[in-house]
Interface confidence: medium
Amino acid sequence: YSHWPSCCPSKGYPSEELLRWSTVPVPPLKPASLDFHSVSCRASEDGPLNSRAISPWRYELDRDLNRLPQDLYHARCLCPHCVSLQTGSHMDPRGNSELLYHNQTVFYRRPCHGKKGNHKGYCLERRLYRVSLACVCVRPRVMG
Amino acid sequence: YSHWPSCCPSKGYPSEELLRWSTVPVPPLKPASLDFHSVSCRASEDGPLNSRAISPWRYELDRDLNRLPQDLYHARCLCPHCVSLQTGSHMDPRGNSELLYHNQTVFYRRPCHGKKGNHKGYCLERRLYRVSLACVCVRPRVMG
């Protein structure tokens, strides 16, 4: 693996703008009629994947202007169990709706200081940030 | 939203190492007994989420040493349909196993040039990169 140095801007270097980019699925623009998926346990026959899933979920915005990406979305399961494929509404207790997590690489900006300690712009500090991506219908874990 | 300047290292600035971090779920260390989940359609009663899912998937490594993160993992569905919650093995054609995609923010390193055009280290160029996160059991889309 290669090692990369961190970086700080200094006068005279290019300063193209780094605009905000979300890195987990931005909930698609959707008709307000789909709002009810956020309160009831059902799997739709249309709409985005998170509405058609038998482990449906909604997205919750997490915004931090000192972080790149500034907007992250966390999945929140709408049902404890999976929705029946047959009806699209009744729960099937044989399946659990579980969150899938991942550790997202994010960058926080913090002041950079030059040799004399004077402020020289911003440095990016890399961190892992736990994000829930989706809800997945799983068979319950059987303990051996 | 705030706008952030891009950054390039220059002499005299901190150069802490930016080490490789994977940003989608690194397949957990698992007994190789779970290898077989990758060849037949079944939902396990133990193991990681991607094995217990009724839309099981495996992870495929995508490595690029000139990208941050250097390692990304793409989900690959193991089944066209969802596995029956009852048996954990038979397919239920009423459900489709569909990939959930997102546009991952990644950074590519490229040479930075100073005022006089001389090489001054690396700049990070931000891009969107499409990654599949998981497979989700969904009700087939009904066309109106």
Partner: antibody
Framework: QVQLVQSGAEVKKPGASVKVSCKAS????????ISWVRQAPGQGLEWLGW????????KYAQKVQDRITMTTDASTTTAYMELRNLRSDDTAVYYC?????????????WGQGTLVTVSS | DIQMTQSPSSLSASVGDRVTITCRAS??????LNWYQQKPGKAPKLLIY???SLQSGVPLRFSGSGSGTDFTLTISSLQPEDFGIYIC?????????FGGGTKVEIK
């Protein structure tokens, strides 16, 4: 009844390649994996690897991984195993087997076998 | 690789006898063990999977037991058609490995 029907016997010279086919019927091909196993004359069974018919995922035994390729064709529900740079010790009966979908891995149906003879 | 050792390597028994074949793994494989029967010139046939589950269509006189490293295949009442080689297989870790086989002959 599930059936796996393999191609006929082959005689090859050292350094050549062989491609054995395995035609599956009477089950949903994409839901199962196919494994390949060989048996040298008078010897035991040796696992060569497997492939997911839907996922295309392959896992090969280290002993042959540089010389073997497994593929599937969903349109004809056929699995293939190609072994390159044949040596005399590759002489064996090659079997394809379906990987079952229970909570563990097992080979629930087998092809009849294909004898591959490597001789100069 | 996990080594699978079967014993005995061969046995001869009479019709109606109770026959026991053992298989030992070189490391713990939990219950990831299958048993196959192979007759001369034929492909193996699955008898038992996951150490003790009887494959559909296999006679009830066949049974399997064990976990960890030691496993047993039992034929409660040997029948004339039960001759052949019995082979164990571990599926805990790749490469999957097979035992050397136990040849069962009818007296």
């Amino acid at each position: 009844q599930v059936q796996l029907v393999q191609s006929g016997a082959e005689v090859k010279k050292p350094g050549a390649s062989v491609k054995v086919s395995c035609k599956a019927s009477e089950y949903t091909f994409s839901n199962y994996g196919i494994s390949w196993v060989r048996q040298a004359p008078g010897q035991g069974l040796e696992w060569l690897g497997w492939i997911g018919a839907y996922s295309g995922f392959t896992k090969y035994a280290q002993k042959v991984q540089d010389r073997i390729t497994m593929t599937t064709d969903a349109s004809t529900t056929t699995a293939y195993m190609e072994l390159r740079n044949l040596r005399s010790d590759d002489t064996a009966v090659y079997y394809c087997a379906r990987v079952g979908t229970g909570t563990d891995s097992y080979f629930d149906f087998w092809g009849q076998g294909t004898l591959v003879t490597v001789s100069s | 690789d996990i080594q699978m050792t079967q014993s005995p390597s061969s046995l001869s028994a009479s019709v109606g006898d109770r026959v026991t074949i053992t298989c030992r793994a070189s490391q713990n494989i939990n219950s990831h063990l299958n048993w196959y029967q192979q007759k001369p010139g034929k492909a193996p046939k699955l008898l038992i999977y996951t150490a003790s589950s009887l494959q559909s269509g296999v006679p009830l006189r066949f049974s399997g037991s064990g976990s960890g490293t030691d496993f047993t295949l039992t034929i409660s009442s040997l029948q004339p058609e039960d001759f052949g080689i019995y082979i164990c297989q571990q599926t805990y870790i790749t490469p999957l490995t097979f035992g050397g086989g136990t040849k069962v002959e009818i007296k």
